[in-house]
């Protein structure tokens, strides 16, 4: 599989409508929780929790502070931590407990604490429970958590030094934890946790399972460096620990390696960055999307692999185990265990088959089974991705988070749309197309290019958004910017399953928001723009220039995948000649203007889509170069003031028949532009301008001001 191409379109932060939330002197907006039925987004930041409107995050609804006392700060600083940064309360667990309360934990100056937040009063209940094993001590340490039936399952570090990893269940009746032992967890970096409910038609009355995803240092191989291995681990919700062996410890903890690599190369993505579980009525079972980078990542490589959860469950249910080998001088420290496996199967959930053998709970499992799982937590079989290859591999980018939305295109094809954030504050939107990947667009969410720490998806009909959290705030973006595609060709070439062209309104619309009957819409995921209605008569810009000056003709082609070339009177221009130049790879500069430069200039784009080349006329300019007598400004117009030796040029934009309302003519000056009221569209198809404007006086004409006719703002 080849590297993914660059995003087709890049939207700068100011180009698109993004909602933003941030408060002065508040940082680390890294815990996000969406309550879709309440249309509320909860934000856990440093020492504060906010509730904001999920439809417009800039609208704050509530806030509650959870600060660290000066005494606690001082004690924390005594232990060698920074009073200004580390010895504060970073909210790390923000989980729904009931319809009226959240369970919240924070680092609390290296003394983690948890409390209950009432959603009716938006105040803490003041329980101040010990957060040890539920929340890290250190704000820099990894963590993950999920609430399952009112009980918190978490992966974090258990001690001040951060040296003791733990996966635990916080439960009043049956608390459980991992063994503090290298074979169980070896310096893990926790990434994600989620519950997978047993399927209602499960033949053996299975148990709900909680999955944990992390990267840890390999125990099975030894290299000169610390080889990282991505893992998927799972525990059973019904686990109650063992009676003597594994007392109050998981009896169902098993872990396996996640494989994400290019089949045709030795490139292995072994550091897990994020995971998203995709559940959809159209899927046989959940699919999880995992985001990876290679361990030695000096070139900025990222990959996404997708896995069927059933593949992982198969490994845990029927796979071989590994065992520790006491072989000296060997690179392999763990080997496949080929001996007899006790019954019931070690690490298995208590299902009807196990119950039939009279083991009604993990508490009465035989010691042999428990001792075996204690010593063999690692599976020999690995979990392989769908199609045995990554869905996406991207160079020169460090992806940080992923969410995936399953959507149906106009033709009924279902696409898994991947939204992947970067460490430079951008969001990529990508889809798999047969054996390639298409990055539809890149949106700069955060102006100052800071890493996206958290990504959340709301795919509720009519309110589909992505929420991104960073150190400085939260940004809300729609799933698509369909309206930014101003032509049918642009809309189709975007190959965005959310967008379709509506000929009646001549706009690119979001599929799920439009009331138009789908038969009236145009969407071609192959990118075949020939389906668009013929528009031979497009708008053009007319310019008048002074002899000897320089003209810059604008070409607003947004596609990064398109090559731009210029034609003059239907001949392709050689822009590398002394007469012409390119500005920003797209705009045409014409030097030393003479009457011979008058005529029609067309900017065309050439874009490879699948195996076809699509040509588009992006802009048309009509130039007239004159040796002008000293002109007089028409009395009906205000006099244009120009400053110094700056230039002023008249630009006239004319729409030909068939286009939408005529664009006002604009006089561009160095100090601004004067807009004239638009006239009704002409009845004839003549290309002659119907508005006659006297030329604005020009001082030393060296540069041309211009106007975009199809403005993307």
């Amino acid at each position: 599989m080849a590297f993914a191409p660059m995003p087709r379109i890049t939207w700068e932060h100011r180009e698109v409508r993004l909602m933003q939330f941030h408060e002065p002197d508040i940082y680390n907006y890294s815990a996000l929780l969406l309550s879709e039925d309440q249309d509320t987004l909860y934000i856990g930041a440093r020492e504060v929790i906010f509730a904001v409107n999920a439809l417009n995050v800039s609208e704050k609804q509530h806030e509650v502070h959870w600060k660290v006392s000066e005494d606690k700060k001082a004690k924390c600083a005594e232990k060698g931590k920074s009073k200004q940064t580390e010895c504060l309360n970073y909210i790390r667990v923000l989980q729904p407990l009931s319809a009226t309360s959240l369970y919240v934990c924070g680092t609390n100056a290296f003394q983690p604490a948890c409390d209950y937040l009432s959603l009716t009063s938006f105040k803490f209940l003041g329980r101040n429970e010990d957060g040890k094993g539920r929340c890290p001590f250190d704000p820099a340490h990894s963590y993950t958590s999920v609430i399952v039936d009112g009980e918190l399952y978490s992966g974090t570090s258990y001690n001040f030094l951060g040296s003791e990893p733990i996966i635990s269940r916080n439960s009043s009746s049956s608390p459980l934890r991992t063994e503090y032992a290298i074979p169980w967890l070896n310096e893990p970096n926790f990434v994600f946790a989620d519950v997978i409910r047993k399927s209602p038609d499960s033949p053996n009355g299975g148990d709900d399972r909680v999955y944990f995803f992390f990267t840890e240092v390999s125990v099975e191989y030894e290299f000169v460096f610390r080889l990282q291995i991505p893992r998927i681990a799972r525990v059973c919700k019904g686990d109650q620990g063992g009676l003597r062996t594994l007392q109050k410890k998981w009896t169902s903890f098993l872990k396996a390696r996640l494989i994400c690599s290019r089949p045709d190369s030795s490139l292995i993505f072994n550091v897990l960055r994020d995971v998203f579980v995709l559940r959809s009525p159209g899927l046989k079972g959940p699919v999880f999307y995992a985001l990876f980078s290679p361990q030695l990542n000096n070139v900025g490589l990222s990959a996404v692999c997708a896995y069927n959860l059933s593949t992982a469950e198969e490994v845990f249910s029927h796979g071989k185990y590994m065992q520790s080998a006491t072989v000296e001088q060997s690179h392999t420290k763990w080997v496949r265990y080929n001996g007899p496996v006790p019954k019931p199967r070690p690490g298995a959930c208590i299902d009807s088959e196990v119950r039939a053998a009279n083991y009604t709970s993990s508490l009465n499992l035989p010691d042999k089974t428990l001792q075996f799982v204690k010593d063999h937590p690692l599976m020999d079989d690995s979990v392989t991705p769908i199609d045995n290859r990554p869905r996406l591999i991207k160079k020169d980018v460090n992806y940080t988070q992923i969410v995936v939305d399953r959507t149906q295109a106009l033709d009924g094809t279902v696409y898994d749309v991947m939204f992947v954030s970067t460490d430079r504050g951008a969001l990529h939107k990508a889809i798999s197309l047969e054996h390639s990947v298409h990055i539809i667009e890149e949106t700069q969410l955060f102006q100052d290019f800071e890493p996206v720490q958290t990504l959340l998806l709301s795919s509720k009909k009519g309110r589909r958004f992505v929420y991104a959290g960073s150190n400085s705030g939260v940004v809300q973006a729609p799933l698509a910017f369909c309206g930014k595609h101003s032509t049918c060709e642009d809309c189709v070439l975007a190959r965005d399953p959310y967008c379709a062209w509506s000929p009646p309104t001549a706009t690119c619309v979001a599929l799920h928001q439009t009331e138009s009957p789908s038969r009236a819409l145009i969407q071609e995921m192959s990118g075949d723009a020939s389906v668009c209605p013929d528009k031979s008569k497009g708008s053009y810009r007319q310019h008048f220039f002074k002899h000897g000056g320089t003209a810059e003709l604008k070409c607003s082609q947004k596609s990064n995948l398109a090559q731009v070339f210029w034609k003059f009177q239907n001949d392709v221009l050689k822009v590398e000649s002394p007469k012409y130049g390119l500005m920003g790879r797209k705009n045409l500069l014409i030097f030393n203007l003479s009457e011979g430069d008058s005529g029609v200039y067309q900017c065309l784009s050439e874009e490879r889509v699948k195996n076809k080349t699509v040509f588009q006329v992006v802009a048309k300019h009509v130039l007239e170069v004159k040796v002008l007598p000293k002109p007089v400004v028409a009395p009906t117009l205000p006099v244009v003031q120009t400053e110094g030796s700056r230039i002023a040029t008249k630009v006239l934009v004319v729409s030909s028949q068939g286009s939408s309302s005529p664009t006002p003519a604009v006089l561009a000056t160095s100090s601004g532009a004067i807009t004239l009221p638009p006239k009704p569209a002409p009845a004839s198809t003549s290309c002659e301008p119907k508005i006659v404007i006297n030329t604005v006086p020009q001082l030393h004409s060296e540069k041309t001001m211009y106007l975009k006719s199809s403005d993307n703002h």
Partner: antibody
Framework: QVQLVQSGAEVKKPGSSVKVSCKAS????????MHWVRQAPGQGLEWMGQ????????SYNQKFKGKATITVDKSTSTAYMELSSLRSEDTAVYYC???????????WGQGTTVTVSS | DIVMTQSPDSLAVSLGERATINCKAS??????????MNWYQQKPGQPPKLLIY???NLESGVPDRFSGSGSGTDFTLTISSLQAEDVAVYYC?????????FGQGTKLEIK
């Protein structure tokens, strides 16, 4: 059987350094954390720090940060503790101990006496 | 840091009699119902030897006259019938929170 064998007694001058070794045998060295505990003459036991033999990741009691450096050599199943800038108050018996699943020190080395004297 | 205080500092008990050593932690050493308290025996010139782990679990090979009890902050090591070979210094140690800390030791002698 499982055992930890430590290097012999050392007499050192103030300001110098000493490196104590602890060789493990009879078990998979990489599977268990190794800790170091010191006992000053006539005194109690003090936990100094620990190391993960798989990763070489060490963590220390704040009191011994900058004083002790714990390392491992996996190829020889040996853990080391180096003490720098020795002073007379560093005179003690230093023990290595294996940290077992149940969160306790189940196997101890015989101890290495370090005497700091001018 | 959690401070472990043992009492008494020294104890003289007749052979065959019960010996009880107490250990008090400055804060709870429990986590989710488990008590991370261990007891060690140290004889002169020897390293410490594990007797009891997790407050009440007897290490394999240790005579069953040794037992441990307690939770939270208060723990007890009991020798039900003192033998001559039990003369040693006994240490409690918590492993719930780093830095792991030991009690100052209790010297057990024969009366």
């Amino acid at each position: 059987q499982v055992q930890l064998v430590q290097s012999g007694a050392e007499v050192k001058k103030p300001g110098s350094s000493v490196k104590v070794s602890c060789k493990a045998s009879g078990y998979s060295f990489s599977d268990y954390y190794m800790h170091w505990v010191r006992q000053a003459p006539g005194q109690g036991l003090e936990w100094m720090g620990q190391i993960n033999p798989t990763t070489g990741g060490a963590s220390y009691n704040q009191k011994f940060k900058g004083k002790a450096t714990i390392t491992v050599d996996k190829s020889t199943s040996t853990a080391y503790m180096e003490l720098s800038s020795l002073r007379s108050e560093d005179t003690a018996v230093y023990y290595c101990a294996r940290y077992y699943y149940g969160r306790h020190f189940d196997v101890w080395g015989q101890g290495t006496t370090v005497t700091v004297s001018s | 840091d959690i401070v472990m205080t043992q009492s008494p500092d020294s104890l003289a008990v007749s052979l065959g009699e019960r010996a009880t050593i107490n250990c008090k932690a400055s804060q709870s050493v429990d986590y989710d119902g488990d008590s991370y308290m261990n007891w060690y025996q140290q004889k002169p010139g020897q390293p410490p030897k594990l007797l009891i782990y997790a407050a009440s679990n007897l290490e394999s090979g240790v005579p069953d006259r040794f037992s441990g009890s307690g939770s939270g902050t208060d723990f007890t090591l009991t020798i039900s019938s003192l033998q001559a070979e039990d003369v040693a210094v006994y240490y409690c140690q918590q492993s719930n929170e780093d830095p792991y800390t030991f009690g100052q030791g209790t010297k057990l002698e024969i009366k």
